[in-house]
Each structure stands twice: as C-alpha cells, then as structure tokens.
C-alpha cells in the first residue's frame, strides 16, 4: 500500500503519529474494529512523553487504550514489547480483578481519570483513543 | 461566518415524539460534535447530547432512554428526536457547536456558535 | 454529574460600576493540561446564549476586554469591570470537563 504522509483530517498530529480522542463509550473490542475502521489502532504508549501527550488531549475519565491480555500475557495491539516497554500503572494494578461480578476477570487496559493505567472488564463502554502512525504503509490497495 | 438555523414542531400532545433539526452553513459541518440544549420556560440551561459526523453520540443519561440524536451529513444537518414527550418537556430547544472533531480537549473554544431555538409546547 | 453552584441569583447593577458573579463547582476543573473547563454565557432577552468566556479565562471573539474570568479548580469569577447597559441578561456558568455537560442555576443582571 501507499504510505501516509500526513494526518487524517481533524486528527491530531504528534511525533509523526495521528491521534483521534472519542467522545462517546465502546467495549473494547468495539473501540478497536472502530480504529482498525479508520486504517489505525487503538492508541500504544512508548513513553512518558507519548503518556503525557495523551493525557493532555483527554478527558478525566475512563479512555481505553491498545493493551489487553485476552490471551494470556499482556500485549500491545501494535506487537510493541510489553516487558521491555513503558508501563504506568496505578499501584496494584493490573491485578485481574474477579470481584466485579460481571463474570471472568479483567483484560484490558484504560487510562484511569489521574491517566495512570488500570485493567478493568473489556465490555465496558468507555471512551478511546485511536493512533496511526506516518510513514506507514495504509492497507489501502496500490491504484492501478 | 458559521450559521446555524433550526426547525421543527412546536406544539406536541402528551406521549408524541418531539423532531427538531439544525442545519450548519458557512463552517465545516464536518470539524465539531454539535449539541442540543434546553431551556423550560423561566429554567436554566440542560444538555441533552451530542453527536459529529460520524453519527458519534453522547446522551446525558437523565434523557437517554429517550433521546435519540442523529446526522446527515450530506445535507450538514443533524437531527433531535425524544419520545414519550410530557409537559415537562415544554421548553425552547438550542443547537450548537462545541468540541472539535479530534475530541481532543486542548482544541475545545466554547460552545460558540448557537440557533436561534424553537420553543417546543406539550399540551393535550 | 458535577452539580454548578452560582451567586447571586439577582445582581442590581449601576452603569459604569463593576460587577462580579460567582461560580462554583462540585468537583475541580482543572485539567492535566493546566485548563480549568469551565465556561461563561450571556443570555440577553429574548436571545439565544453566548460564550463570553471559555477555559476559565479567554474572551471569546467580539467579547469587549470590560469582561473577565478567573478562578481556578472549583472556585470561578466572571467579573464586568464597567457594566453598560447591554450586558443586561442572565449569565451562566457551565463545566465541558465531563458529559454531561451541566450549567449554573444563572444570574440576573438587571440595571438598578
């Protein structure tokens, strides 16, 4: 495919990354397709200065973010290394919480209202933050 | 200059559904979310939601059950419908402009562009 | 939901005196980004809303320089330096940090 030279429009532009802030609530498996709709992923945070950029753009609230470990391990969605990568979790968390009720534990990761990461059940209906990066082959088809 | 100008039904009987529309012109339709506010008569201001336009919403949850707001984007309009109106829904219907599409809160300047409101009346 | 809190209800005000209206929050509105989200509007008679003031502090475009906001976290003043007749209306507060977004009760300037 071709490769992205600038920004989507209205998306936010940052360290040649594209940023897009929902304002309405999805599972995360929703959020996700929704991003992968838009040619992106669910946003994947590589730093501090990345963590803070973020943070800056959202609301106070609940937002998820491009890390589950529906398999098993934590991964990110973009294949980033998750041992080796930048983590902000809340104290104690992720700690896979059953006491919800709601069936299962907790798999997927959200910026909290402090922006400090916490696990929490996939089907809620919280905010999200789609990133694509620039440079990047689109998966769009080569015109002919 | 952005615009916005409304219209819709103003005289409702108890248990009908209210349907008000707001069209955009001169701006980007395309660049905000755009909400509906209320105002009964002599009250204060309430939010009732938002949308952009991808079809995006966000209800305040006092109305969600029965609020339902939607977009066309071809035509830069978007619409209110809420059901099972009462007299307490009696009031003049706002639309404006609030956050930028981005969503992002570093680009938010007011809800700065406002319709001229359309009183809506429910009464048997 | 945050609840908004204004004061006074009614503000009797004379042309060329000052005025000030207050405005208060049931939780802070100060942003990681070091915005308060908290927004002034005029409603003249008869008329639909108007920002006046957004982020706490910025003048909307054509707001005349006479109008000011300031406060920070859950304390707010909109304040009118030299009030003229045309700033007759009610004024309200309203927070955009977290949906749904709600609004003061309002306050009436009316001239005395």
């Known amino acids: 495919g071709s490769e992205r030279t600038c920004c989507p429009v209205n998306w936010v532009e940052h360290e040649r990354s594209c940023y897009w802030f929902s304002r309405s609530g999805k599972a995360w498996a929703d959020a996700d397709n929704y991003c992968r709709l838009e040619d992106a992923h669910l946003v994947v945070v590589t730093s501090w200065e990345e963590q803070k950029f973020v943070q800056h753009h959202i609301g106070p609230v609940n937002t998820w973010m491009g890390l589950h470990d529906q398999n098993g391990p934590w991964k990110w969605v973009d294949g980033t290394d998750y041992e080796t990568g930048f983590k902000n979790w809340r104290p104690e968390q992720p700690d896979d919480w059953y006491g919800h009720g709601l069936g299962g534990g907790e798999d997927c990761a959200h910026f909290t209202d402090d922006g400090r990461w916490n696990d929490d059940v996939c089907q809620r209906p919280y905010r999200w933050v789609c990133e694509t990066e620039l440079d990047k082959a689109s998966q769009e088809p080569p015109l002919l | 200059q952005v615009q916005v100008q409304q219209w819709g039904a103003g005289l409702l009987k108890p248990s009908e559904t209210l349907s008000l529309t707001c069209a955009v012109y001169g701006g980007s339709f395309t660049d905000y979310y755009w909400s509906w506010i209320r105002q009964p008569p002599g009250k204060g201001l309430e939010w009732i939601g938002e949308i952009n336009h991808s079809g995006d919403t966000n209800y305040n949850p006092s109305l969600k059950s029965r609020v339902t707001i939607s977009v066309d984007t071809s035509k830069n309009q978007f619409s209110l419908k809420l059901s099972s109106v009462t007299a307490a829904d009696t009031a003049v219907y706002y639309c404006a402009r609030e956050f930028p599409y981005s969503g992002s809160y570093l680009y938010y300047y007011g809800m700065d562009v406002w319709g001229q409101g359309t009183t809506v009346t429910v009464s048997s | 939901d945050i609840v908004m809190t204004q004061s006074p209800l009614s503000l009797p005000v004379t042309p060329g005196e000052p005025a000030s209206i207050s405005c208060r929050s049931s939780q802070s509105l100060l942003h990681s980004n070091g915005h308060n989200y908290l927004d002034w509007y005029l409603q003249k008679p008869g008329r639909s809303p108007q920002l006046l003031i957004y982020?706490?502090?910025n003048r909307a475009s054509g707001v005349p320089e006479r109008f000011s906001g300031s406060g920070s976290g859950t304390d707010f003043t909109l304040k009118i330096s030299r009030v003229e007749a045309e700033d007759v209306g009610v004024y309200y507060c309203m927070q955009p940090l977290q949906t749904p977004f709600t609004f003061g009760g309002g306050t009436k300037v009316e001239i005395k």
């Open positions: 982020l706490g502090s």
